[in-house]
Amino acid sequence: VQNSCDNCQPGTFCRKYNPVCKSCPPSTFSSIGGQPNCNICRVCAGYFRFKKFCSSTHNAECECIEGFHCLGPQCTRCEKDCRPGQELTKQGCKTCSLGTFNDQNGTGVCRPWTNCSLDGRSVLKTGTTEKDVVCGPPVVSFSPSTTISVTPEGGPGGHSLQVL
């Protein structure tokens, strides 16, 4: 004889000795029907805040408060955001290695400096862990009217003034 607990929907629990589908009590959930118990909802507090509230069928999801980022699966802990010159890995913030940079605050990866020579340009300003190399104009003969333009607009992740 098929156990009637098998027909229970998510958001309910069911005991085999009394096979009736019952709704999960408040602050609990079951994503699979027919289980003998509902699971206690996760609470997001301290450095955590709610990303998704708990429902009878889904656990709550947490994220970190401003200035912190998640580490671990399902955001098990919060760590202070990385600074420019670092990248966020699963092991936490790591300083960019020589020849790479990250100019973003709290996000982004360490990227290799631009190799100006590949685009036929010279290096105008060397790079750091926080800033890319700045390439000069193409290495060609210039007419008297040649100019170097400076753009004040913000770049990916918030670049400051850059020489094109």
């Epitope: 699963k90 790479t100 973003q104 631009t114 685009d119 890319d132 607009e153 913000g154 770049g155 992740g157």
Partner: antibody, heavy 121, light 107 residues
Framework: QVQLVQSGAEVKKPGASVKVSCKAS????????MHWVRQAPGQGLEWMGW????????NYAQKFQGRVTMTRDTSISTAYMELSRLRSDDTAVYYC??????????????WGQGTLVTVSS | ELELTQPPSVSVSPGQTASITCSAD??????ASWYQQKPGQSPVLVLY???KRPSGIPERISGSNSGNTATLTIRGTQPMDEADYYC?????????FGGGTRLTVLR
């Protein structure tokens, strides 16, 4: 809405060059890295490199260094990819793809429709 | 340089769960993304940072990444899920793609 519109199909002879354009709209062009990815017929995806549209900074996959040049024109929100010394095995669909902002590991959240480049004598 | 290895094909019956793997040495230390590509169309991002879904991607698509393997899971697979799937990561200044997996939904 975000859109990346690429130039039309090209047929080129071996040894020639091709320049593919990618016009961006619906977002701040200078705020996101632009990448180029190609796909040979019946094959997988192959990353070619990126350009930072704000600074013009580039990073090319080692395989394409010396043959590829990525540029942009911020006044018309357009990125370009030029591939020189074409060979028959460069026949592929070339995609521009926007790198998602504020994410890790460089995922591409929007893609152009692709440009078929055929290299044939 | 890291190499991402995917099975060339995976078959699944409608309504069943499909799992597509992507393997590389210590891949779990990195973040993986997944793309869906249907014939004649551009790729579409379906997962990033191992398990996050962009808006518009259904909850039945999920992901995990630990050890040497990242996994894309599609619950209640539908005919519309039939496509090529590519994993992708970032390693040593290079964007890497897996070779792709053709997901076939059996009729």
């Amino acid at each position: 809405q975000v859109q990346l519109v690429q130039s039309g199909a090209e047929v080129k002879k071996p040894g020639a060059s091709v320049k593919v354009s990618c016009k961006a709209s619906g977002y701040t062009f200078t705020g996101y890295y632009m990448h180029w990815v190609r796909q040979a017929p019946g094959q997988g995806l192959e990353w070619m490199g990126w350009i930072n549209p704000q600074s013009g900074g580039t990073n090319y996959a080692q395989k394409f260094q010396g043959r590829v040049t990525m540029t942009r024109d911020t006044s018309i929100s357009t990125a370009y990819m030029e591939l020189s010394r074409l060979r028959s095995d460069d026949t592929a669909v070339y995609y521009c793809a926007r790198e998602g902002g504020e994410w890790l590991a460089i995922p591409f959240d929007y893609w152009g429709q692709g440009t078929l480049v055929t290299v044939s004598s | 340089e890291l190499e991402l290895t995917q099975p060339p094909s995976v078959s699944v019956s409608p309504g069943q769960t499909a799992s597509i793997t992507c393997s590389a040495d210590k891949l779990g230390d990195k973040y993986a993304s997944w793309y869906q590509q249907k014939p004649g169309q551009s790729p579409v991002l379906v997962l990033y940072e191992d398990s996050k879904r962009p808006s518009g991607i259904p909850e039945r698509i999920s992901g995990s990444n630990s050890g040497n393997t990242a996994t894309l899971t599609i619950r209640g697979t539908q005919p519309m899920d039939e496509a090529d799937y590519y994993c992708q990561t970032w390693d040593t200044n290079t964007v890497l793609f897996g070779g792709g997996t053709r997901l076939t939904v059996l009729r």
